[in-house]
Structures are given as structure tokens and as C-alpha cells.
């Protein structure tokens, strides 16, 4: 079967700027290890939001710094995007990657349209 | 502006081995997959190899698996293929090409070529 | 691996005219499927790549269309610098495999 991405259309991140959606993918071959990339899109501006290897079976990790986490089971993965404001409202697209064993396969998703609000600030109390 | 120039290539026996490198300039060189693309004598292309931007990952086309290795030094912004056991299929303009960002499998620049032959 | 067909393998057209260039895949490959131009003793440029919604720079006679296992590229108004020969390429699976070549010719 082909490299299939299947992700959202649209996610609303909640009122803290965080957003979190599933991706999906069906695998050719039985990999072991898989990448997962989110990427932004902005105009035709591409730019990586975060990037986790993973081995099946185990959990992903993404770099410390990131400002993302998830979680995997088997060719799902959970993916939360933290710290998100209305400037950052754009399509995030979900890239997975077979990495091993060979062959490599790559698919892409067609994107998660995240709508993000600043939260109104609170008004002063006398 | 981006730029690869490929060197190393010439006139080799069967059998025997050839290094060629390929020298980069004008981006990232270390943010990038690279590739080494052939193209035989008045035919069409063949991809070869790829290397990943950090080294991690290098995969072959079966026709040289076991035979060529693909390399990187992203200090010397250098991208190499060392051939061995050439045989006279293996004679071609050999390209190498910076691989995309958001999608590796692709062919974003291309080098001026570096003629390889095979030949006794 | 994925094996890779083009048809025609040669044309002939003359400026001003559209040219449409078909490639088919032995398998899906989703929409990971690139277009390069080729001139006589130069090395290949990219002209088309995918997924479509990430390219720039593109000339506008130029188009990519397809997805899953048929493709095709149209020329609207063929210059004359478009007189080359065209490879499709896929990005889906190792080994990465060309098209045979289309060369377009002047009638």
C-alpha cells in the first residue's frame, strides 16, 4: 500500500496557545525507525516547527528546546504544539519519514489550518 | 548563489578505484541532504546515491550498493563518492545535486558534471 | 522499485505551441513527483517540483498536474528556449527513478 499522511483540517488551539492534533500514516514496509516532521507554511514559505526520530514501539522525542511533544503508537502519532499565538495561525503540515530499514519512503500531509487567539487581557479591578 | 562543482573524474581501468569530490558553496551545506546523480554517455539519469544533511542516513541504487560510498565533510562544505570495482557500466557524467529541505528525494541544483570512464 | 514511463519519448512542435508530456508510475507515489529540463551538454535543472503548494519561481506556461500513479506537464506557449528534453522524477521511495526523457524538438 502507498505512503499515506492523513491529519485534521482544522484544529483551534485552546486559550493557553496550545494545539494538538493527530497524525496518521499508512505504511508500505514495516519500519522501525520513523522521523516526524512538522512543518509551517506561510505564503509558499516552508519553515520546520520540530522534528522527532523515533524507534516503533518506543516513545518520540523531540529536543528540549522544542515547542513540541507526542506521543506514538503504532502509525498514529499525538502531536501538541505549545506556546502558540494569533501571529502563529498558518498550516502545519505533518511529514513522516520510513528511515529504516531501507528502502526510505516519505509522505506528506495536506495540513492542519491551527487558529490561534490571543487571549483578551484581563481588565484591571479597582 | 548556490553553486557545486564536481572534480575527480577521468579515464580508469575495470576494476580499479576512483574518488570524486564535490565542493559547495553559497548555502547551508550542513542543512542540506546531498546526492550524486549519473547520466551514461547519450542516455537518460540514474540516481546513485544520497547522504543525509548530518551523515545519519545513506542509501544506494542496487546497481552500486556494495561498491560505491557516499560521504560528507560538512567542515570542508565537501560532498565525495568513492567508487570501486568500476566496470564499464559505471562510465558517465556523474552530477552531484543539493537535495530539498522539505523533501530529500529532490533535485534542487545540480553540479556541472565530472566525466567518469571505464576503460581498458 | 518504482518504475517510470513518458510518453511521447520525442515531439516535435513549433513556438507558440502547447505541449502536454505524460508521466505514469508503477505504483502511488502521492503527488512526490518533480519535473527537470534538460539541455544538450548541460546538466539538469529543476522545472517542477511537489508538493505543488511549496514551489516558486515556476514560469507561468509552465504546469504540473497529477497525482497517484499519472502525471503530466503542460507547456501553454512553447518557447524557444523550451526546445529540450524533460525527465519526471519521483521523491516518494528509494531508489529515487527518472522517467526515460521526453525530447521536444523544433518541427
Known amino acids: 500500500k502507498a505512503m499515506h499522511v492523513a491529519q485534521p483540517a482544522v484544529v483551534l488551539a485552546n486559550s493557553r496557545g496550545t494545539a494538538s492534533f493527530v497524525c496518521e500514516y499508512a505504511s508500505p514496509g514495516k519500519a522501525t525507525e520513523v522521523r516526524v516532521t512538522v512543518l509551517r507554511q506561510a505564503d509558499s514559505q516552508v519553515t520546520e516547527v520540530c522534528a522527532a526520530t523515533y524507534m516503533m514501539g518506543n516513545e518520540l522525542t523531540f529536543l528540549d528546546d522544542s515547542i513540541c511533544t507526542g506521543t506514538s503508537s503504532g502509525n498514529q502519532v499525538n502531536l501538541t504544539i505549545q506556546g502558540l499565538r494569533a501571529m502563529d495561525t498558518g498550516l502545519y503540515i505533518c511529514k513522516v519519514e520510513l528511515m529504516y530499514p531501507p528502502p526510505y519512503y516519505m509522505g506528506i500531509g495536506n495540513g492542519t489550518q491551527i487558529y490561534v487567539i490571543d487571549p483578551e487581557p484581563c481588565p484591571d479591578s479597582d | 548563489q548556490v553553486q557545486l562543482v564536481e572534480s575527480g573524474g577521468g579515464v580508469v581501468q575495470p576494476g580499479r578505484s576512483l574518488i570524486l569530490s564535490c565542493a559547495a558553496s553559497?548555502?547551508?551545506?550542513?542543512?542540506?541532504?546531498m546526492h550524486w546523480v549519473r547520466q551514461a554517455p547519450g542516455k537518460g539519469l540514474e540516481w546513485v546515491a544520497v547522504v543525509w544533511y548530518d551523515g545519519s542516513n545513506k542509501y544506494y541504487a542496487d546497481s552500486v550498493k556494495g561498491r560505491f560510498t557516499i560521504s560528507r565533510d560538512n567542515s570542508k562544505n565537501t560532498l565525495y563518492l568513492q567508487m570501486s570495482s568500476l566496470r564499464a557500466e559505471d562510465t558517465a557524467v556523474y552530477y552531484c545535486?543539493?537535495?530539498?529541505?522539505?523533501?530529500?528525494?529532490?533535485?534542487?541544483?545540480w553540479g556541472q558534471g565530472s566525466l567518469v570512464t571505464v576503460s581498458s | 522499485d518504482i518504475q517510470m514511463t513518458q510518453s511521447p519519448s520525442s515531439l516535435s512542435a513549433s513556438v507558440g505551441d502547447r505541449v502536454a508530456i505524460t508521466c505514469r508510475t508503477s505504483?502511488?507515489?502521492?503527488?512526490?513527483l518533480n519535473w527537470y529540463q534538460q539541455k544538450p551538454g548541460k546538466a539538469p535543472e529543476l522545472l517542477i517540483y511537489a508538493p505543488s503548494s511549496f514551489q516558486s519561481g515556476v514560469p507561468s506556461r509552465f504546469r504540473g498536474s497529477g497525482s497517484g500513479t499519472d502525471f503530466t506537464l503542460t507547456i501553454s506557449s512553447l518557447q524557444p528556449e523550451d526546445f529540450a528534453t524533460y525527465y519526471c522524477?519521483?521523491?516518494?521511495?528509494?531508489?529515487?527513478?527518472f522517467g526515460p526523457g521526453t525530447k521536444v524538438d523544433i518541427k
Open positions: 545535486a543539493r537535495g530539498g529541505i522539505v523533501v530529500p528525494g529532490l533535485f534542487e541544483y
Open positions: 522524477q519521483q521523491s516518494y521511495s528509494t531508489p529515487f527513478t
Open positions: 553559497g548555502f547551508t551545506f550542513s542543512s542540506y541532504g
Open positions: 505504483q502511488s507515489i502521492s503527488n512526490l
